[in-house]
């Protein structure tokens, strides 16, 4: 997260760290007792490593009573996700067992009504992604509030030049932005999951390159069909 600040510890009990061989790779969001939603491209970077999900964490390194690492029983990338595009960039991870819920571990309601978030709405994005252009990684969860940007502006030639489909949304990126390592994490508007940080190699913090998020409401049928 660029231009953000340290989050209040455990105030985002849905927040997950998707890890490979014990290292943070991507963000994720607990959407059901046994399921974490993330970004499909995160698996590409996992190679043949052991994928696990850390829940109940604020610090990645320090012991915390609520922290628990779960093995992944099944990884389900969206069937249309491709390495060369950010389309359909969603991944569902089934935990080896139902998460132990508590004040620091709780699923987040996700948007099921397929309507665009009003431009200008302030939404919260959180993650353990890099906090500087130099690539410094935080140990503790960071967050930032970002205004939603209308799709037409986001699709301008000077911005993302038509790449933003109806199934994506954008947020402003003027020095405050999600960045590398935040992919798969939640964009939360009004206490509801609206978007998942896409995992392209986009420049961060440049207002001409807004953050791109996969709209979960547009994938309600797919999410339901996997979770059922």
């Amino acid at each position: 997260i660029l231009g953000g600040r340290e989050a209040e510890a455990h105030a985002r009990p849905y927040m997950a760290s998707v890890q490979v061989n014990g290292e943070h790779l991507c963000g994720g969001v607990l959407v059901a007792e046994q399921w974490v939603l993330s970004a499909a491209h995160c698996l590409e970077d996992a190679a043949d490593g052991k994928v696990q999900v850390l829940l109940g964490a604020h610090s990645l390194s320090q012991p915390e009573p609520s922290k628990r690492l779960y093995d992944v029983l099944r990884a389900v990338p969206h069937p249309d996700s491709r390495p060369d595009t950010i389309d359909h960039d969603l991944l569902l991870l089934q935990l080896s067992e139902k998460a132990t819920l508590g004040p620091a571990v709780r699923p987040l309601p996700w948007q099921r009504v397929d309507r665009d978030v009003e431009p200008g709405t302030l939404c919260d994005v959180a993650g353990w992604g890099i906090v500087s252009h130099a690539g410094r990684r935080p140990d503790r969860l960071q967050h930032v509030l970002l205004p939603v940007l209308d799709r037409a502006t986001c699709n301008r030639r000077t911005h993302h030049d038509g790449a933003i489909t109806q199934r994506m949304m954008c947020a402003e990126s003027n020095r405050r932005d999600s960045c590398k390592g935040d992919s798969g994490g939640p964009l939360v508007c009004g206490g509801v999951l609206e978007g998942v940080v896409t995992s392209g190699s986009r420049v961060c913090g440049n207002r001409k390159k807004p953050g791109i998020y996969t709209r979960v409401a547009s994938y309600a049928a797919w999410i339901d069909s996997v979770l059922a």
Epitope: D80, Q166, W222, S225, A228
Partner: antibody
Framework: QVQLQQSGAELARPGASVKMSCKAS????????IHWVKQRPGQGLEWIGY????????NYNQNFADKATLTADRSSSTAYMQLSSLTSEESAVYYC???????????????WGAGTTVTVSS | DIVMTQSHKFLSTSLGDRVSITCKAS??????VAWYQQKPGQSPDLLIY???TRHTGVPDRFTGSRSGTDFTLTISNVQSGDLADYFC?????????FGGGTKLEIK
């Protein structure tokens, strides 16, 4: 093998209600979500909605939200659909269907009931 | 709602021929499309799901393909048992929607 057995044909008056059943066998009832689909004579198919028998969670096509009510009885492995305030528009065959699908993703349907014919006539 | 348009209500073919049944989605549905065969008085039978994948037991004469939002079910070496109604279905978005159907007939 996996089967969905639907109740027999219904003849109803306009304004009345009907409740049809879909009895599942050959699998654990709570494993699969049960969907309902409408087919009017000589026409296409319309998705009504589904019920997840393990949680009783329902999801309706908004076009049917005020018309259909989906329920499930785990003790008898049976799903039900009630149609209320019937008009001639509800004269159709109604199917229940599930997705067994090995890949466990996507709402396509590989097992269908034989259908229940509803005729609304005064 | 996503509209699935099957432009041909009827298609005439000869036994042994190859025939293509088309379906157009009104917006992007990815590859979340299935095809069903329905014979008179029967319930639909799944043929293809995820655009290309044949359901268990479906002969390889049935193939699915896609170009953008245009979907095609191709039946090669048409047999008398293939004469039926064919429906496409999208399951990308709620509500799930079906095409109006194409009836395959013999010339």
């Amino acid at each position: 093998q996996v089967q969905l057995q639907q109740s027999g044909a219904e003849l109803a008056r306009p304004g009345a209600s009907v409740k049809m059943s879909c009895k599942a066998s050959g699998y654990t009832f709570t494993t699969y979500t049960i969907h309902w689909v409408k087919q009017r004579p000589g026409q296409g198919l319309e998705w009504i909605g589904y019920i997840n028998p393990s949680s009783d969670f329902t999801n309706y096509n908004q076009n049917f939200a005020d018309k259909a009510t989906l329920t499930a009885d785990r003790s008898s492995s049976t799903a039900y659909m009630q149609l209320s305030s019937l008009t001639s528009e509800e004269s159709a065959v109604y199917y229940c269907a599930i997705r067994l699908g090995y890949d466990r993703q996507g709402w396509y349907f590989d097992v269908w009931g034989a259908g229940t014919t509803v005729t609304v006539s005064s | 709602d996503i509209v699935m348009t099957q432009s041909h209500k009827f298609l005439s073919t000869s036994l042994g021929d190859r025939v293509s049944i088309t379906c157009k989605a009104s917006q992007d549905v990815g590859s979340a499309v299935a095809w069903y065969q329905q014979k008179p008085g029967q319930s639909p039978d799944l043929l293809i799901y995820w655009t290309f994948t044949r359901h268990t037991g479906v002969p390889d004469r049935f193939t699915g393909s896609r170009s953008g939002t245009d979907f095609t079910l191709t039946i090669s070496n048409v047999q008398s048992g293939d004469l039926a109604d064919y429906f496409c279905q999208q399951y990308s978005n709620y509500p799930l929607t079906f095409g109006g159907g194409t009836k395959l007939e013999i010339k």
